[in-house]
């Protein structure tokens, strides 16, 4: 889970070791703050949980691409 040490900076200290299906993902945000020990991606899931993931992993990159395409495609 993400950890907000001194709001508004949220950092990730551990990454999930389990792939999450894109069907369970709602959005994401990147963590690039120099105040954090590592770069990370925080996925917000459809069940409101936030999960820290490693941006170097392929499934994480693929999931971000998928979510980017979803937001670019207008709902008709």
């Amino acid at each position: 889970q993400p950890d907000a040490i001194n709001a508004p900076v949220t950092c990730c200290y551990n990454f999930t070791n389990r792939k999450i299906s894109v069907q369970r993902l709602a959005s994401y945000r990147r963590i690039t703050s120099s105040k954090c020990p590592k770069e990370a991606v925080i996925f917000k899931t459809i069940v409101a949980k936030e999960i820290c993931a490693d941006p170097k992993q392929k499934w994480v990159q693929d999931s971000m691409d998928h979510l980017d395409k979803q937001t670019q495609t207008p709902k008709t």
Partner: antibody, heavy 119, light 109 residues
Framework: QVELVQSGAEVKKPGSSVKVSCKAS????????ISWVRQAPGQGLEWMGA????????HYAQKFQGRVTITADESTSTAYMELSSLRSEDTAVYYC????????????WGQGTLVTVSS | DIVLTQSPATLSLSPGERATLSCRAS???????LAWYQQKPGQAPRLLIY???SRATGVPARFSGSGSGTDFTLTISSLEPEDFAVYYC??????????FGQGTKVEIK
């Protein structure tokens, strides 16, 4: 260690309702979902529905839509399954089981509650 | 809904033999969101395998899962007396509903 403890066996008349409880201990109740699964005598497992308190989601299998209500009380870490308009075919063992809403495998199960519907 | 079909319905084997149980889905179970459970008479099911191939905590190494898409397999490398039970597969990529297979009974020959 996570434990799910269900309420005791029930004998009900056709047309009535039954409410089964499932009290969780040893975990963060609101971070997980509770599924309800039933098993008629000598039959397989049948998923009835689920509740995910964190997200406020409740899902029901189409077969039980309108007849089942699943609720949760976070203050007591207890989930409930109410089944109405009971018929003899509803005689079964009813299980609650915990799942992580991001995934869905049922990692901890209650001991089961036998509901007998008989006139 | 995704329909899961397990085969065979019953498997008659002796202790020490290898058991291979099949679970076939009516449509692709993406991301291998499939689990296997063991159920003994009078007991609640017990999670054995999740994500098609990951063993749950405390599950012996003789149990292994494999497969993707529509075809999944549970293998018990060498049957122990306590392994004779009913085994169910379950998909959790779509909910509602999570669906179960009809079960495979592994009995002593």
């Amino acid at each position: 260690q996570v434990e799910l403890v269900q309420s005791g066996a029930e004998v009900k008349k056709p047309g009535s309702s039954v409410k089964v409880s499932c009290k969780a201990s040893g975990g963060t109740f609101s971070s997980y979902g509770i599924s309800w699964v039933r098993q008629a005598p000598g039959q397989g497992l049948e998923w009835m529905g689920a509740i995910n308190p964190l997200a406020g989601h409740t899902h029901y299998a189409q077969k039980f839509q309108g007849r089942v209500t699943i609720t949760a009380d976070e203050s007591t870490s207890t989930a409930y399954m109410e089944l109405s308009s009971l018929r003899s075919e509803d005689t079964a063992v009813y299980y609650c089981a915990r799942y992580d809403g991001i995934y869905g495998e049922l990692d901890f199960w209650g001991q089961g509650t036998l509901v007998t519907v008989s006139s | 809904d995704i329909v899961l079909t397990q085969s065979p319905a019953t498997l008659s084997l002796s202790p020490g033999e290898r058991a291979t149980l099949s679970c076939r889905a009516s449509q692709s179970v993406s991301d291998a969101y499939l689990a296997w459970y063991q159920q003994k008479p009078g007991q609640a099911p017990r999670l054995l395998i999740y994500d098609a191939s990951s063993r749950a905590t405390g599950v012996p190494a003789r149990f292994s899962g494999s497969g993707s898409g529509t075809d999944f397999t549970l293998t018990i490398s060498s049957l122990e007396p306590e392994d004779f039970a009913v085994y169910y597969c379950q998909q959790y990529i779509t909910y509602p509903p999570f669906t179960f297979g009809q079960g495979t009974k592994v009995e002593i020959k």
